[in-house]
């Protein structure tokens, strides 16, 4: 029986050139005449385009939305009602090439074409994109707050902020023809819900958003985002209503960077460089591709590339990568944004060099990669460490702590977070090392203590970066580095001349010289302990509430011992940035720790003293009685104390604590505790130290009071953040 | 219910050697430190040595007065501690006690202990 | 090495009395100090760790407070089952060294 065939409507968005018109300023206005007539003559001309070629049949409606410099281009949409079956024969490059066959026959052509009447279409200056009809939808609720902007080469041209009537606004960006359009996003508020889509094209259609953000995010303050031509429009969508722009967006055109690169490595190892995506930290922009040849000195050698934030993982070949496609000799790889860092390690097999290349595969886009490369010894990858083949990166081995995701570090270990003897395989403890006793058979632990030896888990690296096998010998008054680097900046851990956490007890003046009070509005909210001149350090989660994320709220105070009154060794301080680190991660309390730079450097004095911090290899033995003081509550879900309490904690082994907290304990977590409970930090005591006495009386940072179940709840221990995990990136911050 | 109980004691010449052991119940053996005390006829209690569990390294430590003689060492898979003890002089004559550390509840706490075995060293 | 010093030695008293012992420590050892109970014969008991806190099962007549190198352990109420020698033991570091022993005897 007849059957009606099935007609589906086909969305095309695209622009075209005019070559005998101008533009001007009145066509950006559209309650403007000139934009009226402009549009009502642009549109009558758009239609008898279409309806000239064999796509008039389908001809539904259309629309030319704004207008823009180039003599004069036109912005248009246009739907077509095609047979289902037809669909995909209809693709926006067939279009195109239908509507420009049809311009050129006409070129020439002394015959009278309505569509030519007034405008002189440029054949080669027509652009049609595919879109659908929710964008057109966006588009039009974006029209009563459209703006067209034209930044002409070597301009910044700071955008005028959102209409606050409208709900959502649209900033259609154009700039010189060959230029790419750089973009930059500053939230200025520390929270709003504001939202902001960028598009690689005049208008929004969702299969060219660049990228989208949200909120005023404190992750990225800063935003810049490249497109992949001269043309991008940016939608915002309101939030919460809000007297001030919380936003500020600016555009220049930046000139097409090269992404492609020849290099010889020299021979030897570590980091060599640096590769990145054309103006790094920018995002990426659609259509970016680069090539890097890298050439290696010798077949002992692979080549590592070391990722910050960002990890290579395999793919299934008929699904693209959504964060950038890399090639590494013929094996093809996606990007994916992670909050740890990363290697990958390329075997070398031939001298003929290694070609990495790295694609945009779709238009959306996200934070510029930058990776830094380097050889590796293929035989030896991790001198005195354990290769993680989860993650490319070398961690300690048999060190106690499951660097790696898989654990294999802490398996096949004769002696684990102890010192094996080489007469007979003994372990023994860290702390007997080098200590003037011989502990083994044969005094094995007091060998080559004069002398640097191979680095390993252990070792302590000195600034010339040889490793003596003394354990901990920062500070202990002896040189042990021949370059005396171990008992440099040890103006740290001294307690002053001096005199309620769960189940401890008052602190006296000057007891613990580095302890900070972080306060809002008078309040105490969080710990904090001083370890340099203008530097406090405290857990990220304390500024996990976005209201808590403005530097201005915060006040410091050092010398503190009652939090309802002063006394004259007190000292505050104003917050003059805040750093939180890069791969904290709120939901699992990973990497919780954040620093404060103060506003002045302090003065040192008997109340005012820093806190010392150890180095990567620093070990806390499990055992080792620790300590940590604050203002928190003296019992679960109590008011916080008025005086700085004090506690002696155990430091717990990281199996012991992982099985009770169901492995939920990272690598930057360290616990500390009693079987039975009683002694804990709690509420109020976050971000605060938990310290440990070295032999030589001063205190080293062990941890920062991180989380917990409860506060000294019995087979509960409290988990802190381990220093000697993001010692790297507070010497990175603070130096 | 928490049991120790020391075996091996007995006389023996100076100069030479004895092995205790100390065999733990009603607990797992292998999460725990454990310890020998001794106490010399009218006198006081005094610390020998302690091995700490496997979480914990496995290492030991002793008392100045026994070191290079006495080694302290542990089975978990059969759930008993020893006391190797070498060149034995008088002064270690006592009653030895094996003892239980929860290092869980504090570093160097013994909550267990066993009742003791005598040790005698005479010619 | 920290040396612990236990006075009295010895003490007669009656049952329902309350004694008190006291313990002194040559250095500053925090509250890391335990109070143990032991009759002839059989194996020391654990009664007080950190210096105050009351070990599980432990009745509540026997307590002990004090701290850096100060310390006291006293039994409120005495019962028959009391009369023992009382041992103080510091865990500050090692080795481990004990008070000579206070014995507690019926007057």
């Known amino acids: 029986g007849y059957k009606a065939e099935v007609m589906v409507s086909q969305v095309y968005s695209g622009s075209l050139r005019v070559l005998n018109r101008h533009f001007s300023q009145d066509l950006t206005r559209r309650e403007s005449s000139a934009f009226r007539s402009e549009t009502a003559k642009a549109q009558k001309m758009l239609k008898e385009l279409i309806t000239s070629t064999r796509l008039g049949t389908y001809y539904n409606s259309s629309s030319v939305y704004s207008f823009g410099e180039g003599p004069l281009t036109c912005f248009f949409w246009f739907i077509l009602q095609i047979p289902e079956h037809r669909r995909l024969m209809l693709s926006p490059e067939v279009v195109q090439a239908l509507l420009v066959e049809e311009l050129l026959s006409t070129v020439n052509s002394s015959a009278a074409v309505p569509y030519r009447a007034e405008y002189e279409v440029d054949p080669e200056g027509l652009v049609i994109l595919e879109a659908s009809v929710k964008d057109i939808a966006a588009l039009n609720s974006t029209l009563g707050c459209y703006r067209y902007s034209y930044v002409g080469q070597g301009q910044v041209l700071r955008l005028k902020g959102p209409d606050h009537l409208a709900s959502s606004c649209l900033w259609h960006l154009q700039g010189p023809k060959d230029l790419m359009l750089k973009l930059r996003l500053e939230w200025t508020l520390a929270e709003c819900r504001d939202r902001l889509a960028m598009y690689d094209v005049a208008g929004p259609l969702e299969k060219r958003l660049i990228t989208s953000v949200y909120g005023c995010s404190r992750q990225e303050p800063v935003v810049e985002v490249l497109a992949s031509g001269a043309i991008m429009a940016v939608v915002w969508k309101k939030g919460l209503h809000s007297y001030y722009d919380p936003f500020v967006l600016s555009v220049q055109p930046v000139v097409f960077q090269a992404c492609e690169v020849n290099l010889t490595l020299d021979n030897r190892l570590d980091s060599q460089g640096v590769l990145s995506t054309p103006y790094f930290p920018s995002y990426y922009s659609p259509q970016t591709h680069c090539s890097w040849h890298l050439t290696v000195p010798s077949l002992d050698y692979g080549l590592a590339l070391w990722f910050d934030a960002y990890a290579l993982r395999r793919q299934k070949y008929d699904l693209p990568c959504t964060q950038g496609q890399w090639t590494i000799q013929n094996r093809r790889l996606c990007g994916l944004r992670i909050l740890q860092p990363y290697a990958e390690r390329i075997p070398v097999v031939a001298t003929a060099g290694i070609t990495i290349n790295f694609t945009s595969q779709i238009s959306l886009t996200g934070p510029g990669v930058r990776v830094h490369y380097g050889l590796y010894n293929q035989s030896d990858p991790c001198p005195g460490e354990f290769l993680c083949s989860v993650n490319g990166l070398c961690v300690p081995a048999c060190d106690g702590v499951k660097d790696c995701p898989n654990g294999l570090d802490e398996r096949n270990c004769v002696c684990r977070a102890t010192f094996q003897c080489k007469e007979d395989s003994t372990c023994i403890s860290l702390p007997k090392v080098c200590d003037g006793q011989p502990d083994c058979l044969n005094g094995s632990d007091e060998e080559q203590c004069q002398e640097g030896v191979p680095c390993g888990t252990f070792t302590f690296q000195c600034e010339d970066r040889s490793c003596v096998k003394k354990p901990n010998p920062q500070c202990d008054g002896r040189p042990d580095c021949r370059d005396g680097s171990d008992e440099e900046h040890c103006d740290c851990g001294l307690q002053g001349p001096s005199s309620r956490i769960v189940g401890g007890a008052v602190s006296s003046e000057g007891e613990w010289p580095w302890q900070a009070s972080l306060q809002v509005r008078g309040r105490h909210i969080c710990g904090g302990a001083l370890i340099a001149d203008r530097w406090v350090i405290t857990a990220a989660h304390c500024f996990q509430e976005d209201s808590m994320a403005s530097t201005v709220l915060w006040t410091v105070f050092l010398g503190k011992v009652w939090q309802n009154s002063r006394w004259p060794g007190e000292v505050s301080f104003k917050v003059s940035r805040l750093l939180l680190h890069p791969y904290h991660e709120e939901d699992s309390h990973d990497y919780d720790v954040a620093l404060l730079q103060l506003d002045h450097p302090v003065v040192r004095s008997a109340a005012v003293r820093p806190v010392c911090l150890p180095a990567r290899s620093h070990f806390f033995e499990p055992g080792l009685h620790c300590w940590i003081t604050g203002w928190g509550a003296l019992r679960e879900g109590g008011p916080i104390s008025n005086a700085l309490q004090k506690v002696d904690v155990q430091l717990i082994p990281q199996d012991l604590c992982s099985e009770v907290y169901r492995y939920q304990v990272t690598p930057r977590m360290l616990c500390a505790g009693y079987r039975k409970g009683k002694k804990d930090a709690c509420q109020g005591d976050s971000g605060g130290p938990l310290v440990c006495k070295a032999l030589s009386g001063r205190w080293f940072l062990a941890g920062l009071v991180s989380w917990g179940l409860g506060c000294g709840r019995p087979n509960y221990f409290g988990v802190y953040t381990r220093i000697t995990g993001v010692i790297s990136w507070i010497q990175q911050v603070v130096t | 219910e928490v049991q120790l109980v020391e075996s091996g004691g007995g006389l023996v010449k100076p100069g030479r050697s004895l092995r205790l052991s100390c065999t733990g119940s009603?607990?797992?053996?292998?999460?725990?430190?454990m310890s020998w005390f001794r106490q010399a006829p009218g006198k006081g209690l005094e610390w020998v040595c302690f091995?700490?569990?496997?979480?914990?390294?496995?290492?030991?430590d002793y008392a100045p007065s026994v070191k290079g003689r006495f080694t302290i060492s542990r089975d978990d898979s059969i759930s008993i501690a020893y006391l190797q003890m070498n060149s034995l002089t008088t002064e270690d004559t006592a009653v030895y006690y094996c003892?239980?550390?929860?290092?869980?509840?504090?570093?160097?706490?013994?909550?267990?202990w066993g009742q003791g075995t005598q040790v005698t060293v005479s010619s | 090495d920290i040396q612990m010093t236990q006075s009295p030695s010895s003490l007669s008293a009656s049952l329902g009395d309350s004694i008190t012992i006291t313990c002194q420590a040559s250095?500053?050892?925090?509250?890391?100090l335990i109070w143990y109970q032991h009759k002839p014969g059989k194996a020391p008991k654990l009664l007080i760790f950190?210096?105050?806190n009351l070990e599980t099962g432990v009745p509540s007549r026997f307590s002990g407070s004090g701290s850096g190198t100060d310390f006291t352990f006293t039994i409120s109420s005495l019962q028959p089952e009391d009369y023992a020698t009382y041992y103080c033991?510091?865990?500050?570091?090692?080795?481990?060294?004990f008070g000579g022993g206070t014995k507690v005897d019926i007057k």
């Open positions: 003892s239980r550390n929860d290092i869980l509840t504090g570093y160097y706490i013994f909550d267990y």
């Open positions: 009603g607990f797992t053996f292998g999460d725990f430190g």
């Open positions: 091995i700490r569990s496997k979480p914990y390294g496995g290492t030991t």
């Open positions: 250095q500053d050892i925090t509250n890391y």
């Open positions: 950190d210096a105050s």
């Open positions: 033991q510091q865990y500050y570091n090692l080795p481990l060294t």
